[in-house]
């Protein structure tokens, strides 16, 4: 069971300092941006991180949403990352959900975050280069010191 708590607005970056944004095709991508680029591209660079109370504590349970015309929420259904047009729900009556991730700091680095899927144990949000694009993907990872699964989260509130 997950019960919604508060939400915050955040900019998410990979460890190469590229900014996560949602492109016109609703794809989550990373790109080099100056602070002014980041502001100019809002709201596509501003993510709503909603925190949830978890009936079996496993870290900070969160959803990641973005509000452009409508609110879309990050999902890892079938291990594929996509934004689905939906509001983060107030309650989820299950111990797993395709839209819930566990946000945890990397040990010894409070500013570096990992996001593990609640649906797929050992699968993490990751940045992966595909041709010329840096994509947000779900990655099965047993190399927990891999920088591709680490992010910084900067609160914009």
């Amino acid at each position: 069971y997950f019960g919604k708590l508060e939400s915050k607005l955040s900019v998410i970056r990979n460890l190469n300092d590229q900014v996560l944004f949602i492109d016109q095709g609703n794809r989550p991508l990373f790109e080099d941006m100056t602070d002014s680029d980041c502001r100019d591209n809002a709201p596509r660079t501003i993510f709503i991180i909603s925190m949830y109370k978890d009936s079996q504590p496993r870290g900070m349970a969160v959803t990641i949403s973005v509000k452009c015309e409508k609110i879309s929420t990050l999902s890892c259904e079938n291990k594929i990352i996509s934004f689905k047009e939906m509001n983060p729900p107030d309650n989820i009556k299950d111990t797993k959900s395709d839209i819930i991730f566990f946000q945890r700091s990397v040990p010894g680095h409070d500013n570096k975050m990992q996001f593990e899927s609640s649906s797929y144990e050992g699968y993490f949000l990751a940045c992966e280069k595909e041709r010329d694009l840096f994509k947000l993907i779900l990655k099965k990872e047993d190399e927990l010191g891999d920088r591709s699964i680490m992010f910084t989260v900067q609160n914009e509130d």
Epitope: P107, G122, K140, D142, D146
Partner: antibody, heavy 126, light 107 residues
Framework: QVQLVQSGAEVKKPGASVKVSCKVS????????FHWVRQAPGKGLEWMGR????????KYAERFKDRVTMTEDTSTDTAYMELSSLRSEDTAVYYC???????????????????WGQGTLVTVSS | DIQMTQSPSSVSASVGDRVTITCLAS??????LTWYQQKPGKAPQLLIY???KLQDGVPSRFSGSGSGTDYTLTISSLQPEDEGDYYC?????????FGQGTKLEIK
């Protein structure tokens, strides 16, 4: 309690290949990997590589990548490690081990080699 | 590759003594470090994971500490059955690398 049972000792000639098996007995959850570690007589532990039974993807140590093949048969819960072009320096005890997530009180994951096979002595001698 | 430098390579101590073994990583391994004990002719056994978390069934005289690149295994009051070889392992990045090992002997 998970147990790993390995195949018996082998004596091989230089240039030959050896295939060591590792069978899982007992209840094991999903989301584990098989790793192989070797130990030459009187020496330390050396990581050789790992296989993911879910998709058969492998990662090998650079020094073995041209000679080692790790495979897994999900139907029998058995992992295999084949080492080719054997030389005398490959004389060692070869261990299989499971690599699984352990968690701290906040749910943070740590991968751990928890269950180990009894080891298989491979002797390479002409 | 991440190098793990373990010291000392051997130590001789008496029952009741406090023994410390250290491992130095060539880069930050984010506490993804485990400690193993190995008795002659046997497979290694897990003692500590996540740098400081005691594996179930391991006596509380064993403890681990450290972060970043520096890690320590401490045996607070040495017992005869603690004789054996001890290894650290970094699990942060592939290739996984072990320390060279520490041979612990009871005087």
């Amino acid at each position: 309690q998970v147990q790993l049972v390995q195949s018996g000792a082998e004596v091989k000639k230089p240039g030959a290949s050896v295939k060591v098996s590792c069978k899982v007995s007992g209840e094991i959850s999903t989301g584990y990997y098989f790793h192989w570690v070797r130990q030459a007589p009187g020496k330390g532990l050396e990581w050789m590589g790992r296989i993911d039974p879910e998709d058969d993807s492998t990662k090998y140590a650079e020094r073995f990548k041209d000679r080692v093949t790790m495979t897994e048969d999900t139907s029998t819960d058995t992992a295999y490690m084949e080492l080719s072009s054997l030389r005398s320096e490959d004389t060692a005890v070869y261990y299989c081990t499971t690599w699984r997530i352990y968690r701290d009180s906040s749910g943070r994951p740590f991968y751990v080699m928890d269950a180990w096979g009894q080891g298989t002595l491979v002797t390479v001698s002409s | 590759d991440i190098q793990m430098t373990q010291s000392p390579s051997s130590v001789s101590a008496s029952v009741g003594d406090r023994v410390t073994i250290t491992c130095l990583a060539s880069e930050d391994i984010y506490t993804y470090l485990t400690w193993y004990q190995q008795k002659p002719g046997k497979a290694p056994q897990l003692l500590i994971y996540g740098a400081n978390k005691l594996q179930d069934g391991v006596p509380s005289r064993f403890s681990g500490s450290g972060s970043g690149t520096d890690y320590t295994l401490t045996i607070s009051s040495l017992q005869p059955e603690d004789e054996g070889d001890y290894y650290c392992l970094q699990g942060s990045k592939f290739p996984l690398t072990f320390g060279q090992g520490t041979k612990l002997e009871i005087k």
